[in-house]
C-alpha cells in the first residue's frame, strides 16, 4: 500500500526566522530505520534542504551544519528549520522513506507553505 504523509498546509516563521511543523506518516510496515528529508519546491525546482536517518525509538540527528533539527515520536516527526529569511518563503515538502527492513516504502507530503517575514530594523533611539 502507499504510505500517507501528513503535514500542515501553512506555517508562519517566527521573527527570528524559525519555523516548526509536524510531519506524520502512516507506516504500512514495521520499519526500524527511517529517513526523513525536507525538500523545498521553488517554481518547478525541488532541492534538498536537510535529511536525517533514525532508528525507531531513537532521536533523529541531522548533520552538525544542518539548518534543521527535529525530534521523533512513533510515526511523528517534529521538524524545525532555522535561519530562514524572506527569500526562503516557499513550499517545504516532507519526504519519508522506510529503509529497513525491506520492503522500502516512500511517502511524500503535499508540502507546507512557510512564510518568512524579515523583521523591521529597530529605529535608532535618542536618549
Amino acid at each position: 500500500k502507499a504510505m500517507h504523509v501528513a503535514q500542515p498546509a501553512v506555517v508562519l516563521a517566527s521573527s527570528r526566522g524559525i519555523a516548526s511543523f509536524v510531519c506524520e506518516y502512516a507506516s504500512p510496515g514495521k520499519a526500524t530505520e527511517v529517513r526523513v528529508t525536507v525538500l523545498r519546491q521553488a517554481d518547478s525546482q525541488v532541492t534538498e534542504v536537510c535529511a536525517a536517518t533514525y532508528m525507531m525509538g531513537n532521536e533523529l540527528t541531522f548533520l552538525d551544519d544542518s539548518i534543521c533539527t527535529g525530534t521523533s515520536s512513533g510515526n511523528q516527526v517534529n521538524l524545525t528549520i532555522q535561519g530562514l529569511r524572506a527569500m526562503d518563503t516557499g513550499l517545504y515538502i516532507c519526504k519519508v522513506e522506510l529503509m529497513y527492513p525491506p520492503p522500502y516504502y516512500l511517502g511524500i507530503g503535499n508540502g507546507t507553505q512557510i512564510y518568512v517575514i524579515d523583521p523591521e530594523p529597530c529605529p535608532d533611539s535618542d536618549f
Epitope: 504510505m3 525541488v46 522513506e97 529503509m99 516504502y105 511517502g107 511524500i108
Partner: antibody
Framework: QVQLVESGGGVVQPGRSLRLSCAAS????????IHWVRQAPGKGLEWVAA????????YYADSVKDRFTISRDNSKNTLYLQMNSLRVEDTAVYYC???????????WGQGTMVTVSS | DIQMTQSPSSLSASVGDRVTITCRAS??????LAWYQQKPGKVPKLLIY???TLQSGVPSRFSGSGSGTDFTLTISSLQPEDVATYYC?????????FGQGTKVEIK
C-alpha cells in the same frame, strides 16, 4: 552535466561472473539512491536492484536475489553490480538510473550489454 | 508484489491524433507513478512523475492523470518524433515495477 556511464559488459558463459560499473558525475552522488534496470533483447524494462545513500540499504528483484550484489563507493562516485552464477536469461542491456528526489528515475546511463551464452 | 498492467500493448495512429495509454496497478499506489519514453535504440527518458507532473523539458502535448489504481498517459497531438515504447512504473515501494510497455507507431 549530470550523467551516468556504465561499463563492464561483455560475453560470458553460463555460471560465470561479471562486474558492471556505473560512474556518476555532475551531482552529489551520496545524496541519491541508484538502481540497476535491465532490458532483454526486444523486451521491456525490468528493475534489478537498488542501493541507497551510504550503501547500507540494498534491495533486489527476486530473479537476481542471492546471485547479484549491488554496491557503491561514494568516494569514487561509482556504483557496481557483481553478477554471479549468470544464466542465459540474464542476457540484457543493463542500465543504471538515479532515483530522483521525488522518487522517479530521472537520469539514466547509456547502458552496457551483457550476453550470457555457451 | 504489485503488478502493473498497460494497455494496449501496441497502437498505430496518425500524426495529429490524440493517443491514450492506460496503466493499472493491482493495488492502490496513490500517485506514485511515472511514465517513461524509450525511442528505438535509445535510453529510457522520464516524461511524467507523481502521475501528472511533467518532467522539465517535456513537451506540453504529453499529460498524465489518475490516482490509486488507474492511470492514463495522453499525447494530445501525436508527432512523428513520438514513435517510441512507453512504460509506466510504480515507485511507492520496492520492488520498483514497470508495466510491459506500449509501442506507439505512426499510421
Amino acid at each position: 552535466q549530470v550523467q551516468l556511464v556504465e561499463s563492464g559488459g561483455g560475453v560470458v558463459q553460463p555460471g560465470r561472473s561479471l562486474r558492471l560499473s556505473c560512474a556518476a558525475s555532475g551531482f552529489t552522488f551520496s545524496n541519491y539512491g541508484i538502481h540497476w534496470v535491465r532490458q532483454a533483447p526486444g523486451k521491456g524494462l525490468e528493475w534489478v536492484a537498488a542501493i541507497w545513500y551510504d550503501g547500507n540499504n540494498k534491495y533486489y528483484a527476486d530473479s537476481v536475489k542471492d546471485r547479484f550484489t549491488i554496491s557503491r563507493d561514494n568516494s569514487k562516485n561509482t556504483l557496481y553490480l557483481q553478477m554471479n552464477s549468470l544464466r542465459v536469461e540474464d542476457t540484457a542491456v543493463y542500465y543504471c538510473a538515479r532515483n530522483g528526489v521525488l522518487g522517479a528515475f530521472d537520469i539514466w546511463g547509456q547502458g552496457t550489454m551483457v550476453t550470457v551464452s555457451s | 508484489d504489485i503488478q502493473m498492467t498497460q494497455s494496449p500493448s501496441s497502437l498505430s495512429a496518425s500524426v495529429g491524433d490524440r493517443v491514450t495509454i492506460t496503466c493499472r496497478a493491482s493495488q492502490g499506489i496513490s500517485n506514485y507513478l511515472a511514465w517513461y519514453q524509450q525511442k528505438p535504440g535509445k535510453v529510457p527518458k522520464l516524461l511524467i512523475y507523481a502521475a501528472s507532473t511533467l518532467q522539465s523539458g517535456v513537451p506540453s502535448r504529453f499529460s498524465g492523470s489518475g490516482s490509486g489504481t488507474d492511470f492514463t498517459l495522453t499525447i494530445s497531438s501525436l508527432q512523428p518524433e513520438d514513435v517510441a515504447t512507453y512504460y509506466c512504473q510504480k515507485y511507492n515501494s520496492s520492488p520498483w515495477t514497470f508495466g510491459q510497455g506500449t509501442k506507439v507507431e505512426i499510421k
